[in-house]
Amino acid sequence: QPPPPPPDATCHQVRSFFQRLQPGLKWVPETPVPGSDLQVCLPKGPTCCSRKMEEKYQLTARLNMEQLLQSASMELKFLIIQNAAVFQEAFEIVVRHAKNYTNAMFKNNYPSLTPQAFEFVGEFFTDVSLYILGSDINVDDMVNELFDSLFPVIYTQLMNPGLPDSALDINECLRGARRDLKVFGNFPKLIMTQVSKSLQVTRIFLQALNLGIEVINTTDHLKFSKDCGRMLTRMWYCSYCQGLMMVKPCGGYCNVVMQGCMAGVVEIDKYWREYILSLEELVNGMYRIYDMENVLLGLFSTIHDSIQYVQKNAGKLTTTIGKLCAHSQQRQYR
Amino acid sequence: SAYYPEDLFIDKKVLKVAHVEHEETLSSRRRELIQKLKSFISFYSALPGYICSHSPVAENDTLCWNGQELVERYSQKAARNGMKNQFNLHELKMKGPEPVVSQIIDKLKHINQLLRTMSMPKGRVLDKNLDEEGFESGDCGDDEDECIGGSGDGMIKVKNQLRFLAELAYDLDVDDAPGNSQQATPKDNEISTFHNLGNVH
């Protein structure tokens, strides 16, 4: 094995390199010293490093490592951030289109129900948007609220337009009757099933993308331990102390050091793999009633069908509601 | 039969073309994202190697630094010597991940559990019936003859063609629309969003 070349007799080269790291500081010895105070770059002979230099090298090594890590994850981070933003915006546009389709359906088929219908439809789709973004709203409650709100308007405007103003305090009864008489048939249940399934999947898809960003951000900004800093210093900078400026670390040695430094980070690997594969499975299943685009853009049609169902049964419903929403049953038996 | 929004605003010829062309839908966008993500599936296990290959490492040189001395690149000492009589690498590994890493692992475990639950094929048989038939049978109220069978394929009349929506530059804002005007009202930000869908890397 060849003997190490003698260190630079004046430590000049080391000084000029170190000046780039720490301009203006006089920490580099003029000539090689024994270096008995060194803790990382333990010398086998005279050295051009001081304790202060060693500390600076450690700091620099850890900074280098952080930068390398950030550049390693830059492409992945950009991919997820950009897609999360694109999908969020796309979902909002779908919701907006779905709202407009539904409003157009009311405007063209049931003009007498507007503007109240617009208001209820608007509230429903606002809740849809909030749900997708993670708000703590129950989808069944959203759908129930839509139909509970619509029915009194349908009853008073379409089914019983001659109702005197004095009878308009029956709105609350009509809301209750809507569920108890199942006035819309099974359409609300159908919509609940489709909307809740598609929105749940959409919401978790966005949550997963946002968590992906959080994972990258976390590993991106890791602070490496002192031990790791010492290993990196020994690998990248201790050769300088011997005046070996152009020498590079051995490949195998670098891998061993990196594995040591990144032991914690590498533990994420198993869960990261599972994350991508689980996300793929979710995406593969996002069709038909699991596809919010498909479900929401078709809602106007299902709502229209549900109103037609009410109209078809209007005669029977009006009679039953006349009884149920009377203030007292006794009126009818006097 | 209802006027449907596409009957009002979308030229039938355009509609037919849009249906047969390969559109960039949200669904194809999602699949594209997954394909790109899959190329990063080994991201964390490959990190040590990635960082070594992106930092100065002896590749073509005969000699390299092993942490203590200059050695020949293929000698036993190239990987081993630098670790001798130093702090224990095994100890470093044994410390376990930092609290922030443990936390993020817990979050990953949780989302993976959720993702798996949502993707479970069990229960999809029921969904299939609901999807195709409209309703569970036997839940029809009093009059069996009034039991609805759902609207079949006609039920969802708007296919998921977001690019085609974008290209039509059409945003029917009934709230804003004056009177009964049936004009398409383009919204710049919406259009650009969908054209940008293709530019994400």
């Epitope: 009864c173 009884k323 149920l324 929403c325 203030h327 | -």
Partner: antibody, heavy 117, light 108 residues
Framework: QVQLKQSGAELVRPGASVKLSCKAS????????INWVKQRPGQGLEWIAR????????YYNEKFKGKATLTAEKSSSTAYMQFSSLTSEDSAVYFC??????????WGQGTSVTVSS | QIVLTQSPAIMSASLGERVTMTCTAS???????LHWYQQKPGSSPKLWIY???NLASGVPARFSGSGSGTSYSLTISSMEAEDAATYYC?????????FGGGTKLEIK
Amino acid sequence: QVQLKQSGAELVRPGASVKLSCKASGYTFTDYYINWVKQRPGQGLEWIARIYPGSGNTYYNEKFKGKATLTAEKSSSTAYMQFSSLTSEDSAVYFCACSTYYTMDYWGQGTSVTVSS
Amino acid sequence: QIVLTQSPAIMSASLGERVTMTCTASSGVSSSYLHWYQQKPGSSPKLWIYTTSNLASGVPARFSGSGSGTSYSLTISSMEAEDAATYYCHQYHRSPYTFGGGTKLEIK
């Protein structure tokens, strides 16, 4: 005229269940709610739950969820209330009452339930 | 839940006397959902006054009801022997539907 006829008095052991019935006549059974109300000896009235026989929809007082179960049989115009895991606290007279959305108009004669070992 | 407080809990009145009993709700109740029931020992309750002021079938005209929001009352313009009973106010507005503790009216 409207009548609600309730089943006879019950003497039951603690931990057991009891099923009370309320047979309606004089009106269309499926058009009105049937409510159940509890009255302990010398005490006031406490609403338990209601059912709409037309659809089977039920609404419970949170306090009685898991304790009371309401059902209705359209063919016989009869409403039922099953009361489970009985304790001495459940000893009371139970009334059924039919109602519109607003008012409990007609009441059954009541069924006395005594829980005793 | 809405708590209904009736006062007085027990009262006695002479025949021909005007009687008023009150029912106070812990939060507002719509007048459409506030009712009064009469119950005599060993009998089931009977609807007496519905939606605050409407007399149920067969109830004598000497009875009247009034009120709004959280304060309601039942009045007998001239007490008669058959009026001795317990009267319950009841809100059928917000679940769980509740009854007042009752006002027991006795003959003096």
